[in-house]
Interface confidence: low
């Protein structure tokens, strides 16, 4: 039985040209986290494998940095980075848990005026 829950940074906005940390946290389970996949829509951004370490997809190497922890740092943000991001926790023996984050990248003037999404 899967008892765990994924907590995420929810819906976030960030400034164009800046950076953002995507964070997920798995709680309420004693399952062993074996791997975390970070995906944007259908694209794999990065993998953190408990045994074999981090792997960043080649097309994102220049703009994606591992960490902190199991999180992911996106740098040099562009408007095209707006969209859904998923953290996929592979665990043993529970199976797979998925968390969702929606990121909107805003022009400086908008971001500076505190536009934020409401987390439902």
């Amino acid at each position: 039985m899967m008892t765990g829950t994924i907590e995420t940074t929810g819906n976030i906005s960030a400034e164009k040209g800046g950076s953002i940390i995507l964070q997920c946290h798995l709680s309420s389970t004693t399952a062993q986290v074996t791997q975390v996949n970070w995906e944007q829509q259908d694209q794999l951004l990065a993998i953190c494998n408990a045994d074999l370490g981090w792997h960043i997809s080649p097309s994102f190497k220049d703009r994606v940095a591992p960490g902190p922890g199991l999180g992911l740092t996106l740098q040099s943000l562009t408007v095209n980075d707006t969209g859904e991001y998923f953290c996929i926790y592979h665990t043993y023996p529970d199976g797979t848990y998925t968390g969702r984050i929606f990121l909107e990248v805003l022009e400086s003037s908008v971001a500076e005026h505190g536009a934020r999404f409401q987390i439902p």
Epitope: T34, I47, N49, A50, D51, H55
Partner: nanobody
Framework: QVQLAESGGGSVQTGGSLRLSCEAS????????MAWFRQAPGKERERVAA???????AYADSVKGRFTISKDNAKTTLYLQMNNLKPEDTAMYYC???????????????????WGQGTQVTVSS
């Protein structure tokens, strides 16, 4: 049913090369860790190299820079290219696979997963 069959072993001189192959049947293209282990007489079986379903790799310190693990595109054959072989590389080499979540390799240990029968590698000075 997963079945693994190793080949490519043999006898070589120090500094020589061998390429081991492991034909895998019944292994899904995703979700598997595959690895090479070796066991020398009187010693414990040790993991030489591992590759996840996402093509992440890990090597034992003793073989780094000399051995390369890889899979074919269909992910049904595992390889171990062994260069600059040393007498201490002499052992029986085993192919192993495990369907750990996300291709995780940490659970693949002797006594778990699927194993081939092994192929002998002998390096003489």
């Amino acid at each position: 049913q997963v079945q693994l069959a190793e080949s490519g072993g043999g006898s070589v001189q120090t500094g020589g090369s061998l390429r081991l192959s492991c034909e895998a049947s019944g292994v899904a293209a995703s979700g598997y860790c595959m690895a090479w282990f070796r066991q020398a007489p009187g010693k414990e079986r040790e993991r030489v190299a591992a590759i996840s379903s996402n093509d992440l790799v890990a090597y034992a310190d003793s073989v780094k820079g000399r051995f390369t693990i890889s899979k074919d595109n269909a992910k049904t054959t595992l390889y171990l290219q062994m260069n600059n072989l040393k007498p201490e590389d002499t052992a029986m080499y085993y192919c192993a696979a495990d369907g750990g979540y996300g291709g995780y390799c940490g659970r693949l240990r002797p006594g778990t997963g699927y194993w081939g029968q092994g192929t002998q590698v002998t390096v003489s000075s």
